[in-house]
């Protein structure tokens, strides 16, 4: 039973005091009780609820020799870093016998300079583009009034008179700093200073000016860049791949893009060393002293077909009486497009040239006119694409067929097609 004649008499001889301070404060509340017999465990309440994980200590000092004598019990509660959630009414509680005793309350309050819940963050913005900044602070004490500053200059005449939690900036033409001051009855707290870096706007109207099989000429319109002149623009080209799925605004392509830099002005660039008849995606970004703009969306473009860059290879021509057998292999040089076929020309010393379109076959048997006594007969072959003929091979003289040589059977070409292209020149 608690000390005293009446069972209802509180054992508490010292009650928790009050603590009021700023966030982060370390404080201690104490209560003291005097009991007879076995000292009880002291519990702490906040706003009537037991604090299960309280950082509390307990000291028990006997006042006599006998265990049944009185004991002084001191319990201390530590608040390590005061937060708003720690505020409230604190009491000690003990169970003695079948009774519960609660101390007089002490109060923990938070009162100090404003505390920022949100501060303006560094960011990049395109020149002359609207954006918002956020700042939020709380007490207690309330109210907390905000004052925004741009480049250390207040944007309102007094705290609370201008924009508060959100600052709308219609656009900037130079890199600037923003901060916010939070004012309450205790004083002023200044937020971190956010640097807003002004980058060039995204270029517009990226388009093709001209196309060649291995190069594309592109142009674009630069965006505004504030007070910072553009130093250069960077163009990227990447091979299109059906599986890659480059769409407008999609993530970067997986392979390494071909990157070229353009001095500006002019806002134009010739992109060389490309593959003919190949789909690409291109994009452009422009840079000032403050950094690069965002990239434009990927623009699909395609290089046109070109003519083959070399003649067919390994041409052989053999003659057996009035027939000539000619065969060859595809050019080793790039075709620069889709091979549509081959043209063949043959000519005797004193006879006009005959030009034929062979199609995609790589061999032909010619039915020579007359008795086959034409002398010094030579053959030339060229490959062609939709863009035109590639270079003709050097003239290959017809060799007489010797017995033992293989002579495969081929479709005979009796009538040459009408010449449709320029003659080879010997």
């Amino acid at each position: 039973a608690p000390r005293g004649t009446q069972a209802e008499e509180s054992p508490f001889v010292g009650n928790p005091g009050n603590i009021t301070g700023a966030r982060g404060l370390t404080g201690t509340l104490r209560c003291q009780l005097q009991v007879q017999g076995e000292p009880p465990e002291v519990h702490w309440l906040r706003d009537g609820q037991i604090l299960e994980l309280a950082d509390s200590t307990q000291t028990q000092v006997p006042l006599g020799e006998d265990e049944q004598d009185d004991w002084i019990v001191v319990s201390q509660l530590r608040i390590t870093s005061l937060q708003l959630s720690d505020t409230g009414q604190y009491q000690c509680l003990v169970f003695l016998g079948h009774q519960t005793f609660v101390s007089q309350p002490g109060y923990v309050g938070l009162e100090g300079l404003p505390y920022f819940l949100e501060e303006p963050e560094d960011r990049t913005v395109a020149a002359n583009t609207p954006f918002n900044l956020s700042c939020q602070a709380q007490g207690p004490p309330e109210p907390v009034d905000l004052l925004w500053l741009q480049d250390a200059v207040p944007l309102a005449t007094a705290p609370g008179h201008g924009p508060q939690r959100s600052l709308h900036v219609p656009g900037l033409n130079k890199t600037s700093s923003f901060s916010c001051e939070a004012h309450n009855a205790k004083g002023v707290t200044t937020s971190r200073t956010a640097t807003i870096t002004v980058l060039p706007q995204q270029p517009r109207n990226l388009h093709l000016v001209s196309r060649q099989p291995t190069e594309l000429e592109v142009a674009w319109t630069p965006g505004l860049s504030g007070i910072y002149p553009l130093t250069h623009c960077t163009l990227q080209a990447v091979l299109s791949d059906d599986g890659m799925g480059i769409q407008a605004g999609e993530p970067d392509p997986p392979e390494e893009p071909l990157t070229s830099q353009a001095s500006v002005p002019p806002h134009q660039l010739r992109l060389g060393s490309l593959h003919p008849h190949t789909p690409y995606h291109i994009r452009v970004a422009c840079t000032s002293s403050q950094g690069p703009s965002s990239w434009t969306h990927w623009l699909p473009v395609e290089t046109p077909e070109g003519v083959p860059l070399g003649p067919p290879e390994n041409i052989s021509a053999t003659r057996n009486g009035s027939q000539a057998f000619v065969h060859w292999q595809e050019p080793r040089a790039p075709l620069q497009g889709t091979l549509l076929g081959y043209r063949l020309a043959y000519q005797g010393q004193d006879t006009p040239e005959v030009l034929m379109d062979i199609g995609l076959r790589q061999e032909v048997t010619l039915e020579l006119q007359g008795d086959g006594s034409v002398s010094n007969l030579t053959v030339c072959v060229a490959a062609y694409t939709a863009a035109g003929d590639g270079p003709w091979s050097l003239p290959v003289p017809l060799e007489a067929w010797r017995p033992g040589q293989a002579q495969p059977v081929h479709q005979l070409v009796k009538e040459p097609s009408t010449p449709a292209f320029s003659w080879p020149w010997w």
Partner: antibody, heavy 125, light 107 residues
Framework: EVQLVESGGGLVQPGGSLRLSCAAS????????IHWVRQAPGKGLEWVGW????????YYADSVKGRFTISADTSKNTAYLQMNSLRAEDTAVYYC??????????????????WGQGTLVTVSS | DIQMTQSPSSLSASVGDRVTITCRAS??????VAWYQQKPGKAPKLLIY???FLYSGVPSRFSGSGSGTDFTLTISSLQPEDFATYYC?????????FGQGTKVEIK
């Protein structure tokens, strides 16, 4: 008479471990917070951490967090500082100290009223 | 963390002199400041707690004052046993931090 006695100091190689003890007498460890404070040779005082022996809750300085562990055994009235992954910059005299408990109902902050004699920890290869 | 800056870092004084040591906190610490005395090879001893309260057994020539960010330890009449290094410590926030110390030497 209140007394704190540290032991366990010595020479240890970088990356090694050491366990310091702080034996209390004249008061009950469970009634206060026990702090560890260190002092590098010729330098000032640096707080290492504290423990509430009654609950076992500990709190550490950033410089030792994750490497040092403070514990207590109230039945032996002794606090411990387990030091792992020791570095040359941990070389110091290590003190344990009792937090002063005023008798008022509340206080802000704290002070350390009883200190041990200190034990030297040298981290060197 | 709160920084505690002590001044001077050292001083020379004679027995009987009045000595003042100051400590400045980097932010408001209310009155949560303690002062300690340390002699070579010995543990620190508590002199003042809560900025101005004299700890039990400490001679009355020691006194402390201050609140907020500026604190002072005064020794009204320096005695031979007072030659030592003195440290201030804030405990308003955790971690507690100490000043760098002021060494009081014999002139």
């Amino acid at each position: 008479e209140v007394q704190l006695v540290e032991s366990g100091g010595g020479l240890v190689q970088p990356g090694g471990s050491l366990r310091l003890s702080c034996a209390a007498s004249g008061f009950s460890l469970s009634g206060s917070w026990i702090h560890w404070v260190r002092q590098a040779p010729g330098k000032g005082l640096e707080w290492v951490g504290w423990i509430n022996p009654y609950r076992g809750y500990a709190y550490y300085a950033d410089s030792v967090k994750g490497r040092f562990t403070i514990s207590a055994d109230t039945s032996k009235n002794t606090a411990y500082l387990q030091m792992n992954s020791l570095r040359a910059e941990d070389t110091a005299v290590y003190y344990c100290a009792r937090e002063y408990s005023g008798w008022g109902g509340s206080s802000v902050g704290y002070a350390m009223d009883y200190w041990g004699q200190g034990t030297l920890v040298t981290v060197s290869s | 963390d709160i920084q505690m800056t002590q001044s001077p870092s050292s001083l020379s004084a004679s027995v009987g002199d009045r000595v003042t040591i100051t400590c400045r906190a980097s932010q408001d610490v209310s009155t949560a400041v303690a002062w300690y005395q340390q002699k070579p090879g010995k543990a620190p001893k508590l002199l003042i707690y809560s900025a101005s309260f004299l700890y039990s057994g400490v001679p009355s020539r020691f006194s402390g004052s201050g609140s907020g960010t500026d604190f002072t330890l005064t020794i009204s009449s320096l005695q031979p046993e007072d030659f030592a290094t003195y440290y201030c410590q804030q405990s308003y926030t955790t971690p507690p931090t100490f000043g760098q110390g002021t060494k009081v030497e014999i002139k």
